[in-house]
Interface confidence: medium
């Protein structure tokens, strides 16, 4: 039977001669050269050679365990003369023994990692890993230990795991953002003589909101003209924040001051500036200077850093309002005046008043816009604003006069204002009442006495305060007539009545009745109107049949006798 165990061979042999592996030997070998040893399998005849007489095996080349740790070969012992096996073919192993010929190699040449600034000591950053090709099952050739060569006192590494952690409290990104840490991995458990490899870990501190905004100055001053419309930007302020990204976002607000009603602050997202804008119309004459308290604050606050103080800052903004030359201002938006229609020329009606609202209080002059008073009925005193008539008025022609008065600054004629002036002409009883229409009526020849033949109505162009009250009567020359009479109804109407039974159209075909109409205003106005009455032939129903004047005509024409 075969007489050997497995063979062991040290890797990386550096001798000049072949490396002895071991000896194959059969107990059938009598040492007389009758046995021949044959080797086959992994590397036989090339890597491994055998002395066919003695069974000694040698390795012809330097072997690397990391390349191939085990070789499986087959041994044969045959009768040299007959070639017959004297032993059954057997498989055996050559195991390559490890030496520490490989250093640990990191999985990456360079690692990159981030960790928040101000992180607690011991905060995980990143894990690095190195591998060693040597045999981990034998000795310490592959037992790797990690250590930090560069990066202390900021970071530490766990020797067995390669986990890098923060090692210093209050690491501030605003002070230093980038760190280069060098980690060593050493085999042989880190002992002397161990092989090592290194890697670089680039660590960036990420930002947290640990800095409040800060105004670079405590007071700002801006100027704006009083004419600035709402929304006008008048100045920019900027607080700075040492943080970055959303932690550096700043919101501006007006927190106090007498001007928070008049001004606004908006945040320019691009520049992170606070823009002070006009909110309401300003008036230099009312207020010349405003003081605001403006606050810059971080909207994204981390509660754990609130102990550092409020994440906001304040500044005072002083706004000076500049005077703008403004046109004169009338004491009223519109004026309403009254004047009697019988006013004489140059009668004063009333006055308007305007003044320069500016601090200079420039004097003003007044004028009438002639486009609104083409007939030049009115005039104005350019100095005191008194309105007076320059022509006679007639209420019955025009009741209201709507004119425009202009006030102009004497020192600056470009500055002018206009105001409407409504002048009402008051009624005076200067018109007599008259018949509402032309009255021509008829009477039947067979008419009875006290018969109403016509109702009279009157009109008057005047407009008395208490309304019209007309009285009607026959003119004196007809008052004693025995033919017709007039009855005043006391309601601004009157009736013509017959005074006798029967009329003869052949004797008198037409009567002209003079009627006096008076009003009761002051002074009383009256006029005389004529009512024509024709005598007609009528049927028994009183319907006219003929009104032809067949009677003798008086030389004067028609009779005025009533």
């Amino acid at each position: 039977s075969w007489m050997w165990n497995q063979f062991f061979l040290l890797e990386e042999y550096t001798g000049s001669d072949y490396q002895y592996v071991g000896k194959l030997h059969s107990d059938q070998d009598r040492g007389d050269g009758s046995l021949k040893y044959i080797l086959s399998g992994d590397g036989a005849g090339d890597l491994f050679i055998i002395n066919e007489n003695t069974g000694d095996i040698q390795a012809t080349k330097r072997l690397d365990r990391e390349e191939k740790p085990v070789y499986i070969l087959r041994a044969q012992a045959v009768n040299r003369r007959t070639g017959r096996p004297v032993e059954p073919e057997s498989e055996f192993i050559i195991k390559i023994h490890d030496i520490n010929d490989n250093e640990p190699i990191f999985t990456k040449d360079v690692y990159t990692a981030t960790v928040p600034e101000m992180a607690d000591v011991g905060t995980f950053v990143v894990q690095v890993t190195a591998t060693d090709a040597d045999d981990p099952t034998y000795g310490n050739s592959a037992k790797v230990v990690y250590s930090i060569l560069q990066g202390q006192p900021y970071f530490s590494v766990e020797s067995e795991t390669g986990i890098i952690k923060t090692a210093l409290l209050n690491m501030d990104r605003e002070n230093r953002e980038q760190y280069q840490v060098v980690i060593q991995a050493k085999d042989m458990g880190g002992q002397m003589g161990g092989l090592s490899g290194t890697t670089t870990v680039n660590i960036t501190l990420t930002d947290v909101n640990d800095n409040p905004p800060r105004f670079p100055q405590s007071t700002y001053q801006f100027k704006t003209p009083e004419s600035s419309p709402p929304g006008t930007p008048i100045g920019r302020i900027k607080a700075s924040d040492a943080d970055v990204g959303e932690n550096a976002e700043i919101e501006y607000s007006i927190t106090d001051g007498e001007g928070h009603e008049m001004f606004d602050v908006i945040t320019d997202q691009e520049t992170q500036e606070g823009i002070i804008t006009v909110k309401k119309l300003l008036d230099f004459e009312k207020k010349k200077v405003y003081t605001l308290k403006v606050e810059a604050s971080n909207p994204h606050v981390e509660p754990r850093f609130l102990y550092l103080g409020p994440f906001k800052d304040s500044a005072t903004v002083r706004i000076v309002v500049d005077d703008v030359d403004e046109p004169p201002v009338f004491s009223k938006l519109a004026y309403i005046l009254q004047i009697r229609e019988d006013a004489r020329i140059n009668t004063t009606i009333g006055s308007v008043a305007a003044q320069d609202p500016d601090a200079a209080r420039n004097p003003v002059k007044y004028s009438v816009d002639r486009h609104t008073d083409m007939d030049r009925i009115f005039n104005i005193d350019s100095g005191n604003g008194s309105i007076f008539t320059s022509k006679l008025l007639d209420r019955e022609t025009l009741l209201w006069h709507n004119i425009t008065v202009i006030a102009t600054e004497i020192n600056n004629p470009k500055q002018s204002s206009r105001v409407p002036l409504y002048i009402k002409v008051l009624d005076v009883n200067d018109n007599a009442p008259e018949f509402a229409e032309f009255y021509e009526t008829f009477v039947c020849e067979k008419a009875k006495a006290d018969q109403l033949i016509q109702t009279l109505r009157a009109v008057d162009k005047d407009d008395p305060y208490s309304g019209h009250q007309f009285s009607f009567s026959l003119a004196p020359e007809a008052a004693s007539s025995s033919n017709f009479t007039i009855q005043d109804n006391k309601d601004n109407t009157a009736g013509i009545l017959t005074r006798k039974n029967g009329y003869n159209r052949h004797e008198m075909s037409t009567y002209l009745l003079p009627v006096v109409i008076s009003d009761n205003d002051y002074p009383v106005q009256s006029s005389t109107g004529t009512v024509t009455v024709r005598v007609c032939a009528c049927d028994h129903h009183g319907n006219m049949q003929s009104c032809h004047a067949e009677a003798l005509i008086h030389p004067t024409g028609l009779s005025t006798g009533a």
Epitope: D207, G245, E246, I250, E251, T267, Q269, P299
Partner: antibody
Amino acid sequence: QVQLVESGGGLVKPGGSLRLSCAASGFTFSSYAISWVRQAPGKGLEWVGFIKSNADGYTTNYAAPVKGRFTISRDDSKNTLYLQMNSLKTEDTAVYYCARIRYFRNWDYWGQGTLVTVSS
Amino acid sequence: DIQMTQSPSSLSASVGDRVTITCRASQTINSYLNWYQQKPGKAPKLLIYRASNLQSGVPSRFSGSGSGTDFTLTISSLQPEDFATYYCQQGDSSWTFGQGTKVEIK
């Protein structure tokens, strides 16, 4: 002036993919977080997801209905935002808007929108 | 997730009317409440941010108020161009929108 212009919309079958782009101009694109928002026909607005700026580590976040299917990315050198939509469903049919996220968590500028129709 | 409930869902009003829209959050959102206006076929437009701040270029007839969970958008005198849909949006925890309020002509 600030402008956002979406493109890439169209008709796609359920299960398909589509990539939308949002080209920005008129502002410093790299300083801003940008969001995608969508609006189904006749419906209200729905936030899809956002990507923060370089200063904030290009962090992304997604609404639950699209998480795992949609990916937002950006190319600051091209001033362009992208929305990669995979495994599309019929309920993803909507007009998709990109919007600039302004400070104080509001969106001050929006694109005109691009219509995505998912139908077999 | 924070839910936002807007009321009313629609309203009819005339030009010159004072209009109030309310928005309620399911939990406190500090002041991270924004209001947007959207017209048909257009992108939304920011009106009010952080509950009460008027966005630049937005007419002063729009105003916002509230804190915690209850917020209000007010249009002091409705103009013809204000007929649109209005959305509230919380930004305290990610983002969610209200369902919208449509303001129509009476």
